[in-house]
């Protein structure tokens, strides 16, 4: 089978600070040295890119400076963290993995992680 399997948790609850973390693991059919990981958000059949990073195996993921994502890699496993989430960002987040080099190219699409974000209640004014 030439398909690449990507596994990710079904559900994750973001912290009260709007931070959600999950692991994206892929079963590499080949010995990739350069990998691109993309987080996609799917809502109402519309898919948008949240963030993307390319890394050399053994090195750290490098997201753009203004990215809301950070991450670390270990073998065929990527630990992803998305920050600054609000309740309106609740949705399905798909992990996409591409083995860019060496040939052949492989594409792997996870089933998605449903991230639930609950905005914190505002602190009540306290009179002393």
């Amino acid at each position: 089978c030439k398909a690449m399997h990507v596994a990710q948790p079904a559900v994750v609850l973001a912290s009260s600070r709007g931070i959600a973390s999950f692991v994206c693991e892929y079963a590499s059919p080949g010995k990739a040295t350069e990998v691109r990981v993309t987080v996609l958000r799917q809502a109402d059949s519309q898919v948008t890119e949240v963030c993307a990073a390319t890394y050399m195996m053994g090195n750290e993921l490098t997201f753009l400076d203004d990215s809301i994502c950070t991450g670390t890699s270990s073998g065929n496993q990527v630990n992803l963290t998305i920050q600054g989430l609000r309740a309106m960002d609740t949705g399905l987040y798909i992990c996409k993995v591409e083995l860019m080099y060496p040939p052949p190219y492989y594409l792997g699409i996870g089933n998605g992680t449903q991230i639930y974000v609950i905005d914190p209640e505002p602190c009540p004014d306290s009179d002393f």
Epitope: C1, K2, A3, M4, H5, P29, E34, R36, T38, L40, V47, T48, E49, A52, I94, K96, M100, Y101, P103, P104, Y105, Y106, L107, G108, I109
Partner: antibody, heavy 118, light 108 residues
Amino acid sequence: EVQLVESGGGLVKPGGSLRLSCAASGFTFSSYTMHWVRQAPGKGLEWVSFISYDGNYKYYADSVKGRFTISRDNAKNSLYLQMNSLRAEDTAVYYCARGGLLGPFDLWGQGTMVTVSS
Amino acid sequence: EIVLTQSPGTLSVSPGERATLSCRASQSVGSSYLAWYQQKPGQAPRLLIYGAFSRATGIPDRFSGSGSGTDFTLTISRLEPEDFAVYYCQQYGSSPWTFGQGTKVEIK
């Protein structure tokens, strides 16, 4: 409007060269992989070449390897295909196509005809 | 290279009838990586189905995809006049990207 527009096709003699262009508009070009696909008259679709987001990685069909070169200019939202040592069997309509975020070719240009004949 | 074989080569169907197109892969293709395209004469292909069964934006629900592993199917539940065209399956999970040879759906 989200679209791809190819240009540069025409009639060329065997052994000649041609450069195809594909102008992208209406989307963030650098966020997508791009492909060239061709279709010989009365035949099916044949994938020709792929280029990664930043242009660092390129793949080719065996039938064009060593003769065709794919490139992109993200600043100009443009994709190119340099075709050298052309043969009669390269005669086809050439389409540029966008590799969608989930992988399939979700946006196609209208195509440009390349005829290789003496 | 994954070889995709479509059958039948030509399908003659009357408007309003159901059309079933088959695509068989030479080796297993993950269902996330199988697409169907429609092409009309003089036009570029148009994405219909991706991930074996998800309809692309704007595609009517009379088009549906199914299958897994090596066998995939495109079904058009009730053929409309504008559906008579050539249909191609494609795998996009690994290079080289490959297409089936196409199935022509013609008016009976």
